[in-house]
Protein backbone atom coordinates (compact mmCIF):
# COMPACT_ATOMS: atom_id res chain seq x y z
CA UNK A 1 0.00 0.00 0.00
CA UNK A 2 1.24 3.45 -0.96
CA UNK A 3 2.30 5.47 2.09
CA UNK A 4 3.11 8.76 0.37
CA UNK A 5 2.16 10.58 -2.81
CA UNK A 6 4.68 11.60 -5.50
CA UNK A 7 6.67 14.71 -4.71
CA UNK A 8 5.49 18.02 -6.16
CA UNK A 9 7.53 20.36 -8.34
CA UNK A 10 8.63 23.70 -6.89
CA UNK A 11 9.93 26.78 -8.71
CA UNK A 12 10.06 30.55 -8.45
CA UNK A 13 8.56 33.10 -10.84
CA UNK A 14 9.95 35.15 -12.42
CA UNK A 15 13.25 33.85 -11.04
CA UNK A 16 14.90 32.42 -7.95
CA UNK A 17 17.17 35.49 -7.79
CA UNK A 18 15.03 38.23 -6.28
CA UNK A 19 16.11 41.86 -5.77
CA UNK A 20 15.40 42.98 -2.21
CA UNK A 21 11.99 44.59 -1.68
CA UNK A 22 10.73 43.10 -4.95
CA UNK A 23 8.07 40.44 -5.29
CA UNK A 24 8.39 36.77 -6.10
CA UNK A 25 5.93 33.92 -6.47
CA UNK A 26 6.78 30.41 -5.31
CA UNK A 27 4.85 27.81 -7.28
CA UNK A 28 4.11 24.29 -6.14
CA UNK A 29 2.60 21.78 -8.55
CA UNK A 30 1.21 18.58 -7.12
CA UNK A 31 -1.88 16.65 -8.18
CA UNK A 32 -5.51 17.35 -8.91
CA UNK A 33 -7.55 16.62 -5.81
CA UNK A 34 -4.94 17.92 -3.37
CA UNK A 35 -6.84 19.65 -0.55
CA UNK A 36 -3.84 21.35 1.04
CA UNK A 37 -0.37 22.50 0.09
CA UNK A 38 2.27 23.48 2.62
CA UNK A 39 5.33 25.58 1.86
CA UNK A 40 8.27 25.01 4.21
CA UNK A 41 11.18 27.37 4.69
CA UNK A 42 14.44 26.16 6.24
CA UNK A 43 12.52 23.30 7.87
CA UNK A 44 9.68 25.41 9.33
CA UNK A 45 6.16 25.85 8.02
CA UNK A 46 6.01 29.07 5.99
CA UNK A 47 2.57 29.11 4.38
CA UNK A 48 -0.50 27.01 3.61
CA UNK A 49 -2.88 27.02 0.65
CA UNK A 50 -6.12 25.07 0.25
CA UNK A 51 -7.12 25.20 -3.41
CA UNK A 52 -10.79 25.48 -4.34
CA UNK A 53 -12.10 23.39 -5.96
CA UNK A 54 -9.25 20.90 -5.38
CA UNK A 55 -10.31 18.57 -8.16
CA UNK A 56 -9.75 21.32 -10.75
CA UNK A 57 -6.43 22.65 -9.47
CA UNK A 58 -3.03 20.99 -9.44
CA UNK A 59 -0.84 24.01 -8.73
CA UNK A 60 -0.77 26.73 -6.09
CA UNK A 61 1.15 29.99 -5.91
CA UNK A 62 2.55 31.60 -2.77
CA UNK A 63 3.17 35.30 -3.11
CA UNK A 64 6.03 37.10 -1.39
CA UNK A 65 5.48 40.84 -1.89
CA UNK A 66 8.67 42.18 -0.25
CA UNK A 67 11.76 40.02 -0.57
CA UNK A 68 14.34 40.42 2.19
CA UNK A 69 17.27 38.52 3.66
CA UNK A 70 15.05 36.83 6.27
CA UNK A 71 13.16 35.08 3.45
CA UNK A 72 16.23 34.02 1.49
CA UNK A 73 17.03 30.35 1.88
CA UNK A 74 15.74 26.90 1.04
CA UNK A 75 12.08 26.19 0.36
CA UNK A 76 10.21 22.95 -0.22
CA UNK A 77 6.56 22.08 -0.52
CA UNK A 78 4.26 19.14 0.16
CA UNK A 79 0.61 18.46 -0.59
CA UNK A 80 -2.16 16.32 0.84
CA UNK A 81 -4.91 14.28 -0.79
CA UNK A 82 -7.33 13.15 1.89
CA UNK A 83 -5.13 12.11 4.80
CA UNK A 84 -2.19 11.08 2.62
CA UNK A 85 0.78 13.47 2.33
CA UNK A 86 3.25 13.65 -0.52
CA UNK A 87 6.99 13.34 -0.44
CA UNK A 88 8.61 16.78 -0.13
CA UNK A 89 9.60 18.54 -3.33
CA UNK A 90 13.20 19.21 -4.23
CA UNK A 91 14.69 22.20 -2.47
CA UNK A 92 14.29 25.61 -4.06
CA UNK A 93 17.08 28.03 -3.22
CA UNK A 94 15.67 31.55 -3.10
CA UNK A 95 18.34 34.23 -3.32
CA UNK A 96 18.00 37.88 -2.35
CA UNK A 97 20.09 40.23 -4.49
CA UNK A 98 20.90 43.95 -4.49
CA UNK A 99 22.41 43.72 -1.03
CA UNK A 100 25.00 46.29 0.05
CA UNK A 101 27.38 46.97 -2.84
CA UNK A 102 28.06 46.65 -6.55
CA UNK A 103 31.05 44.69 -7.86
CA UNK A 104 33.15 45.66 -10.85
CA UNK A 105 33.53 43.19 -13.72
CA UNK A 106 36.42 43.38 -16.17
CA UNK A 107 37.75 41.05 -18.83
CA UNK A 108 41.31 40.32 -20.00
CA UNK A 109 42.69 40.73 -22.62
CA UNK A 110 39.54 42.69 -23.56
CA UNK A 111 35.90 42.38 -24.59
CA UNK A 112 36.74 41.66 -28.24
CA UNK A 113 38.77 38.49 -28.81
CA UNK A 114 39.47 35.92 -31.47
CA UNK A 115 38.20 32.36 -31.20
CA UNK A 116 40.87 30.25 -29.45
CA UNK A 117 42.20 33.09 -27.28
CA UNK A 118 42.32 32.62 -23.51
CA UNK A 119 39.93 34.94 -21.69
CA UNK A 120 39.69 35.69 -17.97
CA UNK A 121 36.97 37.65 -16.20
CA UNK A 122 37.75 39.49 -12.96
CA UNK A 123 35.06 40.34 -10.44
CA UNK A 124 36.05 42.80 -7.71
CA UNK A 125 34.17 43.91 -4.60
CA UNK A 126 35.92 45.77 -1.82
CA UNK A 127 33.49 44.89 0.97
CA UNK A 128 33.69 41.76 3.10
CA UNK A 129 32.89 38.84 0.85
CA UNK A 130 34.95 35.91 -0.41
CA UNK A 131 32.64 34.27 -2.92
CA UNK A 132 31.84 35.64 -6.34
CA UNK A 133 29.47 34.47 -9.05
CA UNK A 134 29.78 35.04 -12.79
CA UNK A 135 26.60 34.73 -14.82
CA UNK A 136 26.09 34.79 -18.54
CA UNK A 137 22.75 36.22 -19.59
CA UNK A 138 20.46 34.06 -21.67
CA UNK A 139 18.31 31.00 -21.34
CA UNK A 140 21.21 28.74 -20.43
CA UNK A 141 21.97 30.88 -17.37
CA UNK A 142 25.61 29.75 -17.12
CA UNK A 143 27.02 30.29 -13.63
CA UNK A 144 30.54 30.00 -12.28
CA UNK A 145 31.79 30.42 -8.73
CA UNK A 146 35.03 32.07 -7.80
CA UNK A 147 36.79 32.83 -4.54
CA UNK A 148 39.11 35.57 -3.37
CA UNK A 149 39.40 38.25 -0.69
CA UNK A 150 38.36 41.20 -2.82
CA UNK A 151 38.61 39.77 -6.33
CA UNK A 152 37.96 36.48 -8.06
CA UNK A 153 39.30 35.24 -11.38
CA UNK A 154 37.10 33.39 -13.84
CA UNK A 155 39.29 31.81 -16.54
CA UNK A 156 37.21 30.77 -19.53
CA UNK A 157 40.19 29.16 -21.27
CA UNK A 158 40.36 29.21 -25.06
CA UNK A 159 37.05 30.69 -26.12
CA UNK A 160 34.74 29.82 -28.98
CA UNK A 161 31.85 31.76 -30.45
CA UNK A 162 29.62 29.93 -27.95
CA UNK A 163 31.18 32.14 -25.26
CA UNK A 164 29.83 35.27 -26.90
CA UNK A 165 27.29 37.12 -24.80
CA UNK A 166 26.71 39.45 -21.90
CA UNK A 167 28.22 38.68 -18.51
CA UNK A 168 27.62 40.08 -15.03
CA UNK A 169 28.97 39.16 -11.64
CA UNK A 170 27.79 39.23 -8.04
CA UNK A 171 29.52 39.20 -4.69
CA UNK A 172 27.97 36.66 -2.35
CA UNK A 173 27.67 37.38 1.37
CA UNK A 174 26.30 33.90 1.94
CA UNK A 175 24.68 31.30 -0.31
CA UNK A 176 21.40 33.20 -0.37
CA UNK A 177 22.39 36.88 -0.12
CA UNK A 178 24.10 38.45 -3.12
CA UNK A 179 25.25 41.94 -3.99
CA UNK A 180 23.87 44.19 -6.70
CA UNK A 181 24.84 42.89 -10.15
CA UNK A 182 27.87 44.43 -11.80
CA UNK A 183 27.55 46.48 -14.92
CA UNK A 184 27.36 44.17 -17.96
CA UNK A 185 30.39 43.21 -20.00
CA UNK A 186 29.67 42.04 -23.52
CA UNK A 187 32.16 39.51 -24.84
CA UNK A 188 32.56 39.48 -28.60
CA UNK A 189 34.28 36.42 -30.05
CA UNK A 190 35.11 36.46 -33.71
CA UNK A 191 35.78 33.25 -35.59
CA UNK A 192 35.47 31.78 -39.06
CA UNK A 193 32.02 31.79 -40.66
CA UNK A 194 31.61 28.02 -40.35
CA UNK A 195 32.15 28.11 -36.57
CA UNK A 196 29.81 31.03 -36.18
CA UNK A 197 26.97 29.27 -37.93
CA UNK A 198 27.48 26.14 -35.84
CA UNK A 199 27.63 28.01 -32.55
CA UNK A 200 25.18 30.89 -32.60
CA UNK A 201 25.10 33.34 -29.74
CA UNK A 202 22.81 32.35 -26.86
CA UNK A 203 19.53 34.25 -26.92
CA UNK A 204 19.91 37.12 -24.50
CA UNK A 205 17.58 39.68 -23.03
CA UNK A 206 17.96 43.44 -23.39
CA UNK A 207 19.69 45.14 -20.47
CA UNK A 208 16.51 46.68 -19.10
CA UNK A 209 14.97 43.28 -18.45
CA UNK A 210 17.98 42.04 -16.51
CA UNK A 211 16.63 43.64 -13.35
CA UNK A 212 13.87 41.06 -13.26
CA UNK A 213 16.42 38.25 -13.62
CA UNK A 214 14.40 36.61 -16.34
CA UNK A 215 17.20 34.27 -17.35
CA UNK A 216 14.70 31.59 -18.21
CA UNK A 217 11.38 32.20 -19.89
CA UNK A 218 8.27 31.48 -17.89
CA UNK A 219 7.10 28.92 -20.42
CA UNK A 220 10.49 27.28 -20.26
CA UNK A 221 10.10 26.97 -16.53
CA UNK A 222 6.72 25.35 -16.80
CA UNK A 223 7.89 22.94 -19.47
CA UNK A 224 10.72 21.50 -17.42
CA UNK A 225 10.53 21.98 -13.68
CA UNK A 226 13.10 19.26 -13.09
CA UNK A 227 15.69 21.09 -15.19
CA UNK A 228 14.89 24.31 -13.36
CA UNK A 229 15.30 22.61 -9.97
CA UNK A 230 18.57 21.13 -11.17
CA UNK A 231 19.89 24.50 -12.37
CA UNK A 232 19.12 26.17 -9.06
CA UNK A 233 20.64 23.31 -7.07
CA UNK A 234 23.85 23.36 -9.07
CA UNK A 235 24.19 27.08 -8.70
CA UNK A 236 24.00 27.07 -4.94
CA UNK A 237 25.68 23.81 -4.00
Amino acid sequence: QQQTLPKPFIWAEPHFMVPKEKQVTICCQGNYGAVEYQLHFEGSLFAVDRPKPPERINKVKFYIPDMNSRMAGQYSCIYRVGELWSEPSNLLDLVVTEMYDTPTLSVHPGPEVISGEKVTFYCRLDTATSMFLLLKEGRSSHVQRGYGKVQAEFPLGPVTTAHRGTYRCFGSYNNHAWSFPSEPVKLLVTGDIENTSLAPEDPTFPADTWGTYLLTTETGLQKDHALWDHTAQNLLR
Epitope: A47, R50, K52, Y63, P65
Partner: nanobody, 126 residues
Protein backbone atom coordinates in the same frame (compact mmCIF):
# COMPACT_ATOMS: atom_id res chain seq x y z
CA UNK B 1 1.24 51.96 3.46
CA UNK B 2 -0.81 49.88 5.90
CA UNK B 3 -1.15 50.73 9.58
CA UNK B 4 -2.37 48.14 12.08
CA UNK B 5 -3.72 48.99 15.53
CA UNK B 6 -4.53 46.26 18.04
CA UNK B 7 -6.98 46.60 20.91
CA UNK B 8 -8.87 44.43 23.38
CA UNK B 9 -6.00 43.25 25.55
CA UNK B 10 -6.21 43.21 29.32
CA UNK B 11 -6.15 41.06 32.41
CA UNK B 12 -8.33 37.99 32.66
CA UNK B 13 -8.63 34.95 34.94
CA UNK B 14 -7.75 31.43 33.79
CA UNK B 15 -10.65 29.96 31.85
CA UNK B 16 -11.83 33.41 30.82
CA UNK B 17 -12.28 34.95 27.38
CA UNK B 18 -11.07 38.01 25.48
CA UNK B 19 -11.57 39.31 21.98
CA UNK B 20 -8.70 41.12 20.32
CA UNK B 21 -9.28 43.44 17.39
CA UNK B 22 -6.89 44.72 14.77
CA UNK B 23 -8.00 47.70 12.72
CA UNK B 24 -6.21 48.26 9.41
CA UNK B 25 -5.99 51.60 7.66
CA UNK B 26 -6.02 51.95 3.91
CA UNK B 27 -8.00 50.33 1.11
CA UNK B 28 -5.79 47.27 0.78
CA UNK B 29 -7.32 45.23 3.62
CA UNK B 30 -9.34 43.00 1.29
CA UNK B 31 -6.14 42.04 -0.56
CA UNK B 32 -4.28 41.20 2.66
CA UNK B 33 -3.66 37.91 4.43
CA UNK B 34 -3.70 38.50 8.18
CA UNK B 35 -2.13 36.82 11.18
CA UNK B 36 -1.76 36.98 14.94
CA UNK B 37 1.53 36.34 16.72
CA UNK B 38 2.48 36.58 20.37
CA UNK B 39 5.58 37.13 22.42
CA UNK B 40 5.81 36.12 26.06
CA UNK B 41 8.45 37.76 28.30
CA UNK B 42 11.88 36.32 27.58
CA UNK B 43 10.61 34.19 24.67
CA UNK B 44 10.64 34.45 20.89
CA UNK B 45 7.66 35.69 18.94
CA UNK B 46 5.44 32.75 17.96
CA UNK B 47 2.64 32.14 15.50
CA UNK B 48 -0.91 31.99 16.89
CA UNK B 49 -3.40 32.06 13.99
CA UNK B 50 -3.77 33.29 10.43
CA UNK B 51 -6.51 33.92 7.91
CA UNK B 52 -6.40 34.19 4.13
CA UNK B 53 -8.21 36.70 1.92
CA UNK B 54 -10.77 33.98 1.26
CA UNK B 55 -11.30 33.27 5.00
CA UNK B 56 -9.30 30.04 5.20
CA UNK B 57 -7.73 29.74 8.65
CA UNK B 58 -4.76 28.03 10.27
CA UNK B 59 -3.95 27.73 14.00
CA UNK B 60 -0.98 26.86 16.16
CA UNK B 61 -1.53 23.51 17.88
CA UNK B 62 -1.36 25.21 21.28
CA UNK B 63 -4.48 27.32 20.60
CA UNK B 64 -6.49 25.02 18.33
CA UNK B 65 -10.05 24.66 19.60
CA UNK B 66 -9.69 27.61 21.98
CA UNK B 67 -8.96 30.56 19.69
CA UNK B 68 -10.83 31.68 16.58
CA UNK B 69 -9.56 34.13 13.98
CA UNK B 70 -12.01 35.99 11.75
CA UNK B 71 -12.13 39.08 9.58
CA UNK B 72 -14.62 41.73 8.58
CA UNK B 73 -13.59 43.32 5.29
CA UNK B 74 -16.30 45.97 5.57
CA UNK B 75 -14.74 47.18 8.82
CA UNK B 76 -11.10 46.56 7.78
CA UNK B 77 -10.71 44.54 10.97
CA UNK B 78 -9.40 41.13 11.97
CA UNK B 79 -10.38 39.52 15.27
CA UNK B 80 -8.94 36.92 17.60
CA UNK B 81 -11.54 35.39 19.90
CA UNK B 82 -9.72 33.74 22.79
CA UNK B 83 -11.46 31.42 25.23
CA UNK B 84 -10.40 28.91 27.90
CA UNK B 85 -7.40 31.15 28.53
CA UNK B 86 -4.41 29.76 30.40
CA UNK B 87 -1.49 31.33 32.22
CA UNK B 88 0.78 30.33 29.33
CA UNK B 89 -1.29 32.51 26.98
CA UNK B 90 0.10 35.60 28.74
CA UNK B 91 1.97 37.61 26.10
CA UNK B 92 1.97 40.68 23.92
CA UNK B 93 -0.24 39.86 20.92
CA UNK B 94 0.70 41.32 17.54
CA UNK B 95 -1.42 41.66 14.44
CA UNK B 96 0.36 41.36 11.09
CA UNK B 97 -0.49 41.59 7.40
CA UNK B 98 0.89 40.35 4.09
CA UNK B 99 -0.11 42.82 1.38
CA UNK B 100 -0.84 41.97 -1.38
CA UNK B 101 -1.28 38.23 -1.75
CA UNK B 102 -3.20 35.48 -3.50
CA UNK B 103 -6.68 34.53 -2.29
CA UNK B 104 -5.99 31.23 -0.54
CA UNK B 105 -2.53 31.96 0.91
CA UNK B 106 -2.28 31.58 4.69
CA UNK B 107 1.07 32.68 6.12
CA UNK B 108 2.50 31.00 9.20
CA UNK B 109 6.10 32.25 9.26
CA UNK B 110 6.69 35.72 10.71
CA UNK B 111 9.21 36.55 7.95
CA UNK B 112 6.40 36.57 5.39
CA UNK B 113 4.57 39.49 7.00
CA UNK B 114 5.42 42.96 5.75
CA UNK B 115 3.24 45.02 8.12
CA UNK B 116 3.02 44.79 11.91
CA UNK B 117 1.04 46.41 14.70
CA UNK B 118 2.48 47.65 17.98
CA UNK B 119 0.89 44.88 20.05
CA UNK B 120 -1.58 44.55 22.90
CA UNK B 121 -0.85 42.89 26.24
CA UNK B 122 -2.89 39.92 27.44
CA UNK B 123 -2.34 38.81 31.03
CA UNK B 124 -3.92 35.62 32.38
CA UNK B 125 -3.64 35.29 36.14
CA UNK B 126 -5.86 34.21 39.06
Amino acid sequence: EVQLVESGGGEVQPGGSLRLSCAASGRTFASAAMGWFRQAPGKEREFVAAISRSDDTYYADSVKGRFTISRDNAKNTVYLQMSSLRAEDTAVYYCAAVVPTYGNNIYVHSAAYNYWGQGTLVTVKP
